[in-house]
Interface confidence: low
C-alpha cells in the first residue's frame, strides 16, 4: 500500500526508533558524506517506518562471522511511498539500511525514473556504526520542487557484487495548471466558424477549462482539458483566452486576438520613380492588409487629357515588390494613375489618383524622299530629304542624324553626322574613291533617335569621271534603292 504524506501533515520524526544493534537516535554519526551542500528544508517525511524489512530485492551475504552465524538478508527499510506537495516547496526524504560491519566501501546512490542522479543534488549519506552493524541513512532533499522533479526515486546499494534496491518513493509536485497548448491568434472570415484549442495539465488533475471572450465567459459549464471551442463566427474583432482550473487554483492563458478579415485599405503614397516616353515606373505603400495577405494589385491608368475617351487601362501585377512599370503608353501624354490591391476577401478601394506624364518620344517615322548625288567638282556628296510627319507626342524635332557607310575593296567605315532641326539637306565629304557610299537618315527629338530611312547607295568613281545623276530612296514597293548613273 502506498503511504501518502501530504504537506499539511506534521512531519514524521526523522528516526522513529532505534536501529538494530541498539543504535540510539541521539548518536551522532561517525561519518557524514554530503553529495552536495544546500539548504535542508524544514518539511520532512519519515525516512523509515516500523515494519518488516523489504524483501523484494535483498542480498544474501555469503560471508559468516567467526562464530559462523549466517547473516540476515540485507534490505532497505520501508519508507514513505508517496509524497504530494506544492510547487516551490521544499522536501526531504531518505532511505535507510543496516549493514553488517564486515562489509566495507558501501555506497548508496540515488536514482530517479531509472536514471542515476549525479552532480549537484542535495544528497547526504550518514553512517551510524554500532558493534555489529552500521546504520546508513541516505537523505535526499530538494529546496524548491518543480514539476520536473515529479517521478519515482529509489536508493541502490552495491554489496558483494549484489545490488540492493529500495522501494520507490513517488514524488508528486502539484501546482496551478500548466498550459501545454494555448489558443493562437487567428485571422478569420466574417461569420465563418473556427476552432480554438486550449490544453492544460496538472497535477492535480482534472484540469477544467473555461473560455473567455472579451472578458465574458463563453461556457457556463467547464470542459475537461483539452478543450476545443468552436466559435460559429464573428462579426467583429474579439479577444479570447481560456482559464484552466484545478484544485490548486486557476491559470489564465494569454489573450489572443481574433481578427476579422476584411478588404484591404487602399494603397498610399503612390509615386513616380521613373518616366520614359512609353513607360512609367511607379511604387506604392500598401495599405492595411485587412488581416489577410495581399494576393495581387491592379494599376489603373486613365488619360488625363480632357478630350480623351476616358477609357481605363488595367495592369495586374503581384502584390510584391510594390513596384510596377506601366508600359505601352503614349509619349508626351498625361495620365492619372491609381492602385488597388486585393486579398482573399476582395479588392481595396483605389488609392488617391496621381498625375504622371510620359516624356517626349523619339520620332516614329523616318525622313522621306532621301536623295543622294555626287558633286565631283567639290568632291562632296549632297544629300536631301523631306521632314517626316511628326506626331505631337514625338516632341519637338531637334535635328537629324545621317549615317554614311563607305565600302570598297577591303574597306568599310561608318560615319555619323548631326544636322540642325531646320535643315533638309546636308553635304558630306567624299571619304573614299572607287567605293560605294550608303546613306541613311533619322529624325531626332529630345526623346531620342527615330528610325533610319531605307539606305540609298551611290558609287563614287575614281578621279576624272563625269558627274552622276542622283540616287534616291525607292518608291514604296520597290526592293532596293536604285543607283542611277
Amino acid at each position: 500500500a502506498i503511504t501518502e504524506a501530504r504537506e499539511e501533515a506534521k512531519p514524521y520524526p526523522l528516526f522513529p526508533g532505534p536501529f538494530p544493534g541498539s543504535l540510539q537516535t541521539d548518536h551522532t554519526p561517525l561519518l557524514s558524506l554530503p553529495h552536495a551542500s544546500g539548504y535542508q528544508p524544514a518539511l520532512m517525511f519519515s525516512p523509515t517506518q516500523p515494519g518488516r524489512p523489504h524483501t523484494g530485492n535483498v542480498a544474501i551475504p555469503q560471508v559468516t562471522s567467526v562464530e559462523s552465524k549466517p547473516l540476515p538478508p540485507l534490505a532497505f527499510k520501508h519508507t514513505v511511498g508517496h509524497i504530494i506537495l506544492s510547487e516551490h516547496k521544499g522536501v526531504k526524504f531518505n532511505c535507510s539500511i543496516s549493514v553488517p560491519n564486515i562489509y566495507q566501501d558501501t555506497t548508496i546512490s540515488w536514482w530517479k525514473d531509472g536514471k542515476e542522479l549525479l552532480g549537484a543534488h542535495h544528497a547526504i549519506t550518514q553512517f551510524y556504526p554500532d558493534d555489529e552493524v552500521t546504520a546508513i541513512i541516505a537523505s535526499f532533499s530538494i529546496t524548491s520542487v518543480q514539476r520536473s522533479d515529479n517521478g519515482s526515486y529509489i536508493c541502490k546499494m552495491k554489496i558483494n557484487n549484489e545490488e540492493i534496491v529500495s522501494d520507490p518513493i513517488y514524488i508528486e509536485v502539484q501546482g496551478l495548471p500548466h498550459f501545454t497548448k494555448q489558443p493562437e491568434s487567428m485571422n478569420v472570415t466574417r461569420n465563418t466558424a473556427f476552432n480554438l484549442t486550449c490544453q492544460a495539465v496538472g497535477p492535480p488533475e482534472p484540469v477544467n477549462i473555461f473560455w473567455v471572450q472579451n472578458s465574458s465567459r463563453v461556457n457556463e459549464q467547464p470542459e475537461k482539458s483539452p478543450s476545443v471551442l468552436t466559435v460559429p463566427g464573428l462579426t467583429e474583432m474579439a479577444v479570447f483566452s481560456c482559464e484552466a482550473h484545478n484544485d490548486k487554483g486557476l491559470t489564465v492563458s494569454k489573450g489572443v486576438q481574433i481578427n476579422i478579415k476584411a478588404i484591404p485599405s487602399p494603397p498610399t503614397e503612390v509615386s513616380i520613380r521613373n518616366s520614359t516616353a512609353h513607360s512609367i515606373l511607379i511604387s506604392w505603400v500598401p495599405g492595411f492588409d485587412g488581416y489577410s495577405p495581399f494576393r495581387n494589385c491592379s494599376i489603373q491608368v486613365k488619360e488625363a487629357d480632357p478630350l480623351s475617351n476616358g477609357s481605363v487601362m488595367i495592369f495586374n501585377t503581384s502584390a510584391l515588390p510594390h513596384l510596377y512599370q506601366i508600359k505601352q503608353l503614349q509619349a508626351l501624354a498625361n495620365y492619372s494613375i491609381g492602385v488597388s490591391c486585393m486579398n482573399e476577401i476582395g479588392w481595396s478601394a483605389v488609392s488617391p489618383w496621381i498625375l504622371a506624364s510620359t516624356t517626349e518620344g523619339a520620332p516614329s517615322v523616318a525622313p522621306l524622299n532621301v536623295t543622294v548625288f555626287l558633286n565631283e567638282s567639290s568632291d562632296n556628296v549632297d544629300i536631301r530629304w523631306m521632314k517626316p510627319p511628326t506626331k505631337q507626342q514625338d516632341g519637338e524635332l531637334v535635328g537629324y542624324r545621317i549615317s554614311h557607310v563607305w565600302q570598297s575593296a577591303g574597306i568599310s567605315k561608318e560615319l555619323l553626322e548631326e544636322v540642325g532641326q531646320n535643315g533638309s539637306r546636308a553635304r558630306i565629304s567624299v571619304q573614299v574613291h572607287n567605293a560605294t557610299c550608303t546613306v541613311r537618315i533619322a529624325a531626332v527629338t529630345r526623346g531620342g533617335v527615330g528610325p533610319f530611312s531605307d539606305p540609298v547607295k551611290i558609287f563614287i568613281p575614281a578621279h576624272g569621271w563625269v558627274d552622276y545623276a542622283p540616287s534616291s530612296t525607292p518608291a514604296p514597293g520597290n526592293a532596293d534603292p536604285v543607283l542611277i548613273i
Epitope: 461569420n191 463563453v218 466559435v231 460559429p232 463566427g233 464573428l234 474579439a238
Partner: antibody, heavy 125, light 112 residues
C-alpha cells in the same frame, strides 16, 4: 412561461429596410441563442440566421448574408432582425425562435423549442 | 445544403385513425457525437410553429404520447396512433445536424 412577443406587421416599399423586434420573457435571455425563420406565403420555412446574446456572435444563412443584421438589446431581453434592400421576394412571415443553450450557433442541436407569433412583412410599391 | 424531402404534400385522414408522415434527407443526419438531430414541428392553421419531437423520437413536454418519431440515417417517420381534431395542420421535419439548418416542405394533415 417562456414567451416571444414580436412587433406588428410591416408594409414597406422596395429598396427600403425593415427592423423587426422580438421581446422575450420567462427565461434568462443571455443563456439561449435566438434565431429567425422566414415563411413565404404558402411555402415552407427557411432559417435566416442566429444570434448569441451572450457573446454577440452571429451566424447567417448564406442567402441572407450581407442583407440581414441580427442584434440584441440585453437590457430589455429583445432581439432584432433588420433586412435591407427589400424586394417583393422578401414578403413573408418572419418568426423569432429560441435556440439551444449558449454558443451553439453552428453546432448540431435541437433548436426552435419556442416561437414568436410571427411578423408579416409586405414589400410593395 | 442538406435537402429535406417530405413526399406527401397532403395527407387526408379520418379522426381516430392512424397517420404516418415520412421525411427523407439528402445525407445522413447522424452526427459525429452519435446523435441524430431530426426534429418535427406542427404549424396549426393561423398559428406559429410548435416543436413536437426532437432527436428523432423525444417528445417535447406537453406533447401527447399518441405521437411517435422513428427512423435513422436519412429516413424518418412521424406517426400519430389516433388522429384528433387538434392534430390538424402542417407538419415540418427539419435537421439540426448540418449547418445551415434546413426544413422539409411540409405535409398538410387534413380531415377526410
Amino acid at each position: 412561461e417562456v414567451q416571444l412577443q414580436q412587433s406588428g406587421p410591416e408594409l414597406v416599399k422596395p429598396g427600403a429596410s425593415v427592423k423587426i423586434s422580438c421581446k422575450t420573457s420567462g427565461y434568462t435571455f443571455t443563456e439561449y441563442t435566438m434565431h429567425w425563420v422566414k415563411q413565404s406565403h404558402g411555402k415552407s420555412l427557411e432559417w435566416l440566421g442566429g444570434f448569441n446574446p451572450n457573446n454577440v456572435i452571429t451566424s447567417y444563412n448564406q442567402r441572407f448574408q450581407g442583407r440581414a443584421t441580427l442584434t440584441v438589446d440585453k437590457s430589455s431581453s429583445t432581439a432584432y432582425m433588420e433586412l435591407r434592400s427589400l424586394t417583393s421576394d422578401d414578403s413573408a412571415v418572419y418568426y423569432c425562435t429560441r435556440g439551444d443553450l449558449l454558443w451553439s450557433l453552428l453546432l448540431p442541436g435541437n433548436y426552435f423549442d419556442y416561437w414568436g407569433q410571427g411578423t408579416t412583412l409586405t414589400v410593395s410599391s | 445544403d442538406v435537402v429535406m424531402t417530405q413526399s406527401s404534400l397532403t395527407l387526408s385522414v379520418t379522426i381516430g385513425q392512424p397517420a404516418s408522415i415520412s421525411c427523407k434527407s439528402s445525407q445522413s443526419l447522424l452526427d459525429s457525437d452519435g446523435k441524430t438531430y431530426l426534429n418535427w414541428l406542427l404549424q396549426r392553421p393561423g398559428q406559429s410553429p410548435k416543436r413536437l419531437i426532437y432527436l428523432v423520437s423525444k417528445l417535447d413536454s406537453g406533447v401527447p404520447d399518441r405521437f411517435t418519431g422513428s427512423g435513422s440515417g436519412t429516413d424518418f417517420t412521424l406517426k400519430i396512433s389516433r388522429v384528433e381534431a387538434e392534430d390538424l395542420g402542417v407538419y415540418y421535419c427539419w435537421q439540426g445536424t448540418h449547418f445551415p439548418w434546413t426544413f422539409g416542405g411540409g405535409t398538410k394533415l387534413e380531415i377526410k
